[in-house]
């Protein structure tokens, strides 16, 4: 999906009003020195591409993020504020339902959510490219 035509300000507002707080709740009890962010993004569409990938694509050691509250709210925000996003996700959602597993918060998931927080920071403030 090409995130170029999303309403970035509305997505930012959704993130700051609820999603950010859900991420903090998920990470509660984790030391702020524990994880080193290795995934980066250069502009808002790129950031949303990386956020979508880390939030919804199962990875080795962390298969369950898509069922977390912050993921569901992220999906809703993208569906509302990115034209045509919902249609691209129907097949992906059906595939995800087939491999539904119980929620387990692993260290790998905590690391992945730490990466997500970093990507959202850059989405909110893509200051390093002149606006």
């Amino acid at each position: 999906y090409d995130f170029t035509n999303c309403d970035f300000e509305k997505i930012k507002a959704a993130y700051l009003s609820t999603i950010s707080k859900d991420l903090i709740t998920y990470m509660s009890g984790t030391k702020s020195t524990e994880f080193n962010n290795t995934v980066s993004c250069s502009n808002r569409p790129h950031c949303l591409t990386e956020i979508q990938s880390l939030t919804f694509n199962p990875t080795a050691g962390c298969a369950s993020l898509a069922k977390e509250m912050f993921a569901m709210k992220t999906k809703a925000a993208l569906a509302i504020w990115c034209p045509g996003y919902s249609e691209t996700q129907i097949n992906a959602t059906q595939a995800m339902k087939k491999r539904r597993k119980r929620k387990v918060t692993t260290n790998k998931c905590l690391e992945q959510v730490s990466q997500l927080q970093g990507l959202w920071r850059r989405f909110n403030r893509p200051l390093l490219k002149q606006q």
Epitope: N37, S114, W120, N124, L127
Partner: antibody
Framework: EVQLVQSGAEVKKPGSSVKVSCKAS????????IEWVRQAPGQGLEWIGV????????NYNENFKGRATLTADKSTSTAYIELSSLRSEDTAVYYC????????????WGQGTTVTVSS | DIVMTQSPDSLAVSLGERATINCKAS??????VTWYQQKPGQSPKLLIY???NHYTGVPDRFSGSGSGTDFTLTISSLQAEDVAVYYC?????????FGQGTKLEIK
């Protein structure tokens, strides 16, 4: 506990350079932007620029382009600002600050470094 | 550059009374406004981010509102420890810019 500790006060001659350090602790240094802000005596706050310690990317206020250089050393979790061609108007308290967890504000600030430029 | 203009420059309010500080941007900054408090001889402290979100540990008597070009910081019941200079800041466009500051004193 997140802390930003800056180097001590400096007195410099006009035309010279100054380098101020900002040592971070209590968090992963490379994960958060470091901002630099200055405050002239009795005046308000002026944003100088920002650096991403993770990759060294910077962005500067045009008013300081060519005179200010921001760098970061991940091995020591220290950010630096170097200001060249100093003039009396550069007399100010220089602050480093860290972006907050959402990327929309500066949540931790250094104690400030006073730079005095005088002949 | 986006100019942030605060009003008034200084303000004297009685203890327990409401204090209101305004901030006007020279062009729309959406909701990208932050408020800081600076006490004499100290570094600035974050109060409110993204217009109306309280930073951790900031008392409920502080609140922010507004959007576009007009923003307000309100202290609902002034306490002695609130004596300080307050700054608004926009982070919507480069360069980031601050208001000139509003000095709040006890009447």
């Amino acid at each position: 506990e997140v802390q930003l500790v800056q180097s001590g006060a400096e007195v410099k001659k006009p035309g010279s350079s100054v380098k101020v350090s900002c040592k971070a602790s209590g968090y992963t240094f490379s994960n958060y932007l470091i901002e630099w802000v200055r405050q002239a005596p009795g005046q308000g706050l002026e944003w100088i620029g920002v650096i991403d310690p993770g990759n060294g990317d910077t962005n500067y206020n045009e008013n300081f382009k060519g005179r200010a250089t921001l760098t970061a050393d991940k091995s020591t979790s220290t950010a630096y600002i170097e200001l060249s061609s100093l003039r009396s108007e550069d007399t100010a308290v220089y602050y480093c600050a860290r972006e907050d967890n959402t990327g929309t504000a500066f949540d931790y600030w250094g104690q400030g470094t006073t730079v005095t430029v005088s002949s | 550059d986006i100019v942030m203009t605060q009003s008034p420059d200084s303000l004297a309010v009685s203890l327990g009374e409401r204090a209101t500080i305004n901030c006007k941007a020279s062009q729309s900054v959406s909701s990208d406004v932050t408020w800081y408090q600076q006490k004499p001889g100290q570094s600035p402290k974050l109060l409110i981010y993204y217009v109306d979100n309280h930073y951790t540990g900031v008392p409920d008597r502080f609140s922010g509102s507004g959007s576009g070009t007009d923003f307000t910081l309100t202290i609902s019941s002034l306490q002695a420890e609130d004596v300080a200079v307050y700054y608004c800041q926009q982070h919507h466009r480069f360069p980031l810019t601050f208001g000139q500051g509003t000095k709040l004193e006890i009447k």
